[in-house]
Interface confidence: low
């Protein structure tokens, strides 16, 4: 059962796992949600009736029955983890805490103009978990305007105390606001020989990398595969750090793989969601339950539905035994990972999918695409929307992309002459324009947010957000596309598609069926040569064939240039402008979305 409200002056008795310090009950709830075992918590607020050493303590708790006895206690605030809830969860915390000093290892001290600058510094520093900033009113003259960057083993403060004229806050890495590079490569036959901060068991290097990504201290990792010569180290995932933030020594070793934390691009990759099945693999751990199940998929469902289950092993039925049902072993451990991994015993293992909701919805795999052909099939581009205007008559105006459950990203030039959002309708999950009838459901537009530097498409800033009046329920036919990570600026995308209902040639009409075209990206230098009379800026991105023939055209504006990278689709461009359509040596020009990620997040994450 999902309980979101906090219980004032209430303490849960017993079930303690560990105590951490958090600046608020709300953040205590987030910490509990991300902890592998925590189901309930009790937070102690500052209060004259309470011992100051207990202020800001957040006690994480577990219970077999998923609840604990309640006791009245002034200043105590209790609640439940969001693990039991089905809604999206985020660790992003933009709150600034006035007159609180969050204690940790102060590893960097510098002057900053404001708390915001200090927070940005923390967000762009690989080691920083949180910061404290002494304002201009801080009594001690030499500490005024000092920004202290801090880290701890757990990512949460070691203590929190009241201190006048300081403010504290957390790194915004988990808000996708970091400018740190995102190194996605996994290096085969490589061991990083730096200090280990932790080790866990993992079935493959990808799971090891995801564990590293959401471990507060892990910057890179080394994984020993099941062929690793030393048996006791097989499937071992070593979580590592270094002072510089990079591995100091790389050793060539067969059957080992190494890679980096993907913290700065975690909003566009799955981090918590380990959805694969591992055949002929047994996960060992504390047994929660043994249930009969028809298949390993059914076993995964059972694990996902049992809130305390973290991973499972399924042993298929012996012929004609137990109505063809096998045994499903639901398991857990102190850190969410198996205590040991064994091979060759016939089991099929995997993880709960309960934590997938902690990842961005946009990372979910979508159905395989139909290769070839220009007409799309249903569900092929589930983020693509058709934006209609109802004035003077209803018609398709522009394309757009779902980037959040209340947000569509499109082009600013679409709104020339649009006086009010009231005349706009957003249709999602549409393949054919002919599906749209009077009674077809649509999303009304609450607000049009046009980039304030936009003047005309050719001069850039051709980007706009539509805030919908109601939220989109994600399904196979309507779901978001990931924004590119700022750390991915140097990625070379090779699998890019432009989609829309636009014209197929310059003098044409809107197409009925959503069209698609695979188009290569063109460097900005090359693009600039083709558009001598324009300035192609770094905020634009170009795509097209030298010989022409495939391109976006009138009516495609605002729609996506979608590129697949590491199995995840990213919104790399927004269809903006071009000279004619599909002309030889005239690539299409798109708004370069990665350059506007800050703007998008600022507008969409505003409280």
């Amino acid at each position: 059962e999902c309980v979101t409200q906090l219980l004032k002056d209430t303490c849960f008795e017993g079930g303690d796992i560990t105590t951490v310090f958090t600046p608020s009950a709300k953040y205590c709830q987030v910490v509990c949600t991300y902890h592998p075992r925590c189901l309930l918590f009790t937070f102690t607020a500052e209060s004259p009736s309470e011992d100051p050493t207990r202020w800001f303590t957040c006690v994480l708790k577990d219970s077999v029955t998923e609840t604990l006895p309640r006791v009245n206690r002034t200043a105590a605030i209790s609640g439940y983890s969001f693990k039991q809830c089905s809604h999206q969860i985020s660790a992003c915390n933009k709150d600034i805490y006035v007159d609180l000093d969050m204690k940790g290892i102060n590893y960097n001290s510098s002057v900053a103009k404001s708390a915001q600058e200090c927070q940005e510094r923390c967000t762009d520093d690989v080691h920083c978990h949180f910061f404290t900033y002494a304002t201009r009113q801080f009594p001690s003259l030499e500490h005024r305007n000092i920004c202290l960057l801090k880290h701890t083993q757990t990512g949460t403060p070691t203590r929190i105390t009241k201190l006048d004229k300081v403010v504290s806050g957390f790194s915004l890495k988990s808000c996708a606001l970091s400018n740190l590079a995102c190194i996605r490569d996994i290096f085969p036959n490589t061991v990083f020989a730096d200090s280990n901060i932790d080790s866990v068991m993992a079935p493959d290097a990808f799971v090891c990398g995801r564990i590293c990504t959401h471990h507060p201290g892990c910057l890179f990792f080394t994984f020993f595969s099941q062929e690793w010569p030393k048996e006791s180290q097989r499937n071992l995932c070593l979580l590592k750090t270094s002072e510089s933030g990079l591995p100091s020594t790389r050793i060539k070793k067969s059957k080992a793989l190494s890679g980096f934390s993907l913290q700065s691009c975690r909003h566009s990759i799955p981090v918590f969601c380990h959805s694969s099945f591992y055949h002929d693999t047994d996960f060992l751990g504390e047994e929660l339950d043994i249930v009969a199940a028809k298949s390993h998929e059914a076993c995964q469902k059972l694990c996902t539905n049992a809130v305390r289950c973290q991973f499972f092993t399924y042993t298929p039925a012996q012929a004609s035994c137990n109505e063809g049902k096998g045994k499903c072993y639901l398991k857990l451990s102190s850190n969410g990972s198996p205590t040991k991994i064994l091979h060759g015993r016939g089991g099929i293992s995997g993880y709960t999918l309960r934590l997938c909701k902690m990842d961005n919805e946009c990372t979910t795999k979508i159905k395989p695409r139909i290769v070839g052909g220009t007409a799309s099939v249903r569900g092929e581009w589930p983020w693509q929307v058709t934006l209609h205007t109802t004035s003077p008559t209803q018609r398709h105006l522009c394309g757009g992309s779902i980037i959040g459950n209340q947000w569509i990203l499109t082009a600013a030039h679409c709104f020339y002459g649009v006086e009010s959002p009231k005349i706009l309708r957003v249709y999602s999950g549409i393949l054919n324009q002919s599906e749209i009838k009077e009674d077809t459901s649509f999303f009304g537009v609450q607000e049009i947010i046009i980039h304030d530097q936009y003047k005309m498409a050719e001069s850039g800033y051709d980007i706009a957000l539509l805030k919908l009046e109601t939220t989109v329920n994600y399904t196979d036919s309507q779901r978001p596309i990931c924004l590119p990570s700022k750390g991915d600026r140097n990625v070379i995308y090779t699998d890019c598609w432009v989609t829309g209902w636009g014209y197929r040639k310059l003098r044409d009409k809107i197409q009925n069926t959503l069209q698609k075209a695979k188009i290569p990206l063109v460097t900005n230098e090359e693009c600039q040569k083709r558009y001598r009379g324009h300035k192609i800026t770094h905020k634009m991105i170009c795509a097209g064939y030298r010989e022409g023939g495939k391109d976006a055209c009138k009516g495609d504006s605002g729609g996506p240039l979608s590129c697949k990278h590491n199995e995840v689709w990213h919104l790399v461009g927004i269809t903006s402008w071009g000279e004619g359509c599909a002309q030889r040596e005239r690539p299409g020009v798109y708004t370069n979305v990665v350059e506007y990620v800050d703007w998008i997040l600022e507008k969409t994450q505003a409280v």
Epitope: S114, Q116, R136, V167
Partner: nanobody
Framework: QVQLVESGGGSVQAGGSLRLSCAAS????????MGWFRQAPGKEREGVAV??????HYADSVKGRFTISQDNSKNTVYLQMNSLRAEDTAVYYC??????????????????WGQGTLVTVSS
């Protein structure tokens, strides 16, 4: 460049209410500090209310009657003025800054100022 535009001023009877708004444009993040100042004819400009990183501060003369609030998503600050008195008559200015205030809540260290909106309270 940053622009602050006030609105909501006007004439009101003593005891009445007004709500002033100040919208900031040209700056992408929310300001650390936003505030309202006023200048009555022939007097110096004085601080009325300030909101700094979410905490609010008021001049003694308006405490309990005026409320300052901020909408970070729109970079807008509001001043709800209740139980207005004749002595509240003034031009009300909105101010904003990215830096912290410098020791006195109502020091004139703000970088950005609006053009002002006139509030007239008749008894």
């Amino acid at each position: 460049q940053v622009q602050l535009v006030e609105s909501g001023g006007g004439s009101v009877q003593a005891g009445g209410s007004l709500r002033l708004s100040c919208a900031a444009s040209g700056y992408t993040y929310s300001f650390n500090s936003m505030g309202w100042f006023r200048q009555a004819p022939g007097k110096e400009r004085e601080g009325v209310a300030v909101i700094y990183l979410g905490s609010t501060h008021y001049a003694d003369s308006v405490k309990g009657r005026f409320t300052i609030s901020q909408d970070n998503s729109k970079n807008t600050v509001y001043l709800q003025m209740n139980s207005l008195r004749a002595e509240d008559t003034a031009v009300y200015y909105c101010a904003a800054d990215l830096l912290e205030y410098d020791g006195t809540w109502f020091g004139s260290t703000y970088n950005y100022w609006g053009q002002g909106t006139l509030v007239t309270v008749s008894s």
